[in-house]
Amino acid sequence: NFMYSKTVKRLSKLREYQQYHPSLTCVMEGKDIEDWSCCPTPWTSFQSSCYFISTGMQSWTKSQKNCSVMGADLVVINTREEQDFIIQNLKRNSSYFLGLSDPGGRRHWQWVDQTPYNENVTFWHSGEPNNLDERCAIINFRSSEEWGWNDIHCHVPQKSICKMKKIYI
């Protein structure tokens, strides 16, 4: 009976995600057969989050909208380890929007999910950010510094990275 009700709950949860994520990839968390964590196929997973590299070229606003219709946000990077994981899936000749912007152009950077902006956990390229008209952040590769962040005009179309919490069933 317990197993039956658990299965019913799982099925109803899966139905919630079906519209935008018809297929999920799930792994067993720990030793308990009851706990599964899932990411939409073909998203990648790291710790408690799922990541998707969007290759369509869009402005920052539309990139965020694109993530939100999939139940995600533009990526919020919280640690060096997280960034190191993300860059494994990026192309060196492309730039990708992050969920970081400075809407007022006053260098008050803010993350899309309201995570406090911590100057100590940022990975700006040297000399960046450097322009008050460039109010959105990208991650890109520079041969001298490897991967880092850069400010850019929000209307310049770029690829982007979406991030969502893992789905637990």
Epitope: G56, M57, Q58, S59, T61, K62, K65, N66, V69, N131, D133, E134, I152, H153, H155, V156, P157
Partner: antibody, heavy 118, light 107 residues
């Protein structure tokens, strides 16, 4: 007031290149993207690409990739669109347009007719 | 790439008529749509953006509606100066493609 003034008509031979200019005034040149759109005689409109004058970032329509180059000169508030390896199908009026704060084309140049003929 | 299909390609109407032009996108463009008016020998002029927001200085007889993939431009009472060609354009992702145009002619 915002103005985009384009260079004059050009006649080119197939295989040649053309460089059209778009001089902006009446606003902060480096703050707004400039896009290029073309229109063949009696035909519809076709988006070619965009340039951000502040830093020179570009994004091109894949259809023109390798043939189109957009550049800018901040000292004269001018954007340039160069199209190479011209063919007769490139005969068109070429427009520059400013992308406004709302992310749409709010101001357009008057257009430049480029004729490709042998 | 998202394709924009506009219909009709031309129509004849009289002054005072209500005119409707439709634009269908090949994918969801989330209301990121503009409508332009173009007269012979002139550059296009922005009429509406975000599918339904009137651009500055555009008369209120022009209106837009729609969502997802289907959008409509309506001229409630056609005026002599409205005889022109109308284009839709999406701004969801590059390339920002246009519809094929609708020529509004005098009946």
């Amino acid at each position: 007031q915002v103005q985009l003034v384009q260079s004059g008509a050009e006649v080119k031979k197939p295989g040649a290149s053309v460089k059209v200019s778009c001089k902006a005034s009446g606003y902060t040149f480096t703050s707004y993207l400039i896009h290029w759109v073309r229109q063949a005689p009696g035909q519809g409109l076709e988006w070619m690409g965009t340039i951000y004058p502040g830093r020179g970032d570009t994004s091109y329509n894949q259809k023109f990739k390798g043939r189109v180059t957009m550049t800018r000169d901040t000292s004269t508030s001018t954007v340039y669109m160069e199209l190479s390896s011209l063919r007769s199908e490139d005969t068109a009026v070429y427009y520059c347009a400013r992308m406004g704060d709302n992310e749409y084309f709010d101001y357009w140049g008057q257009g430049t007719l480029v004729t490709v003929s042998s | 790439d998202i394709q924009m299909t506009q219909s009709p390609s031309s129509l004849s109407a009289s002054v005072g008529d209500r005119v409707t032009i439709t634009c269908r996108a090949s994918g969801n463009i989330h209301n990121y749509l503009a409508w332009y008016q173009q007269k012979p020998g002139k550059a296009p002029k922005l009429l509406l953006y975000d599918a339904e927001t009137l651009a500055i200085g555009v008369p209120s007889r022009f209106s837009g509606s729609g969502s997802g993939t289907d959008y409509t431009l309506t001229i409630s009472s056609l005026q002599p100066e409205d005889f022109a060609t109308y284009y839709c354009q999406h701004f969801w992702s590059t390339p920002y493609t246009f519809g094929g145009g609708t020529k509004v002619e005098i009946k």
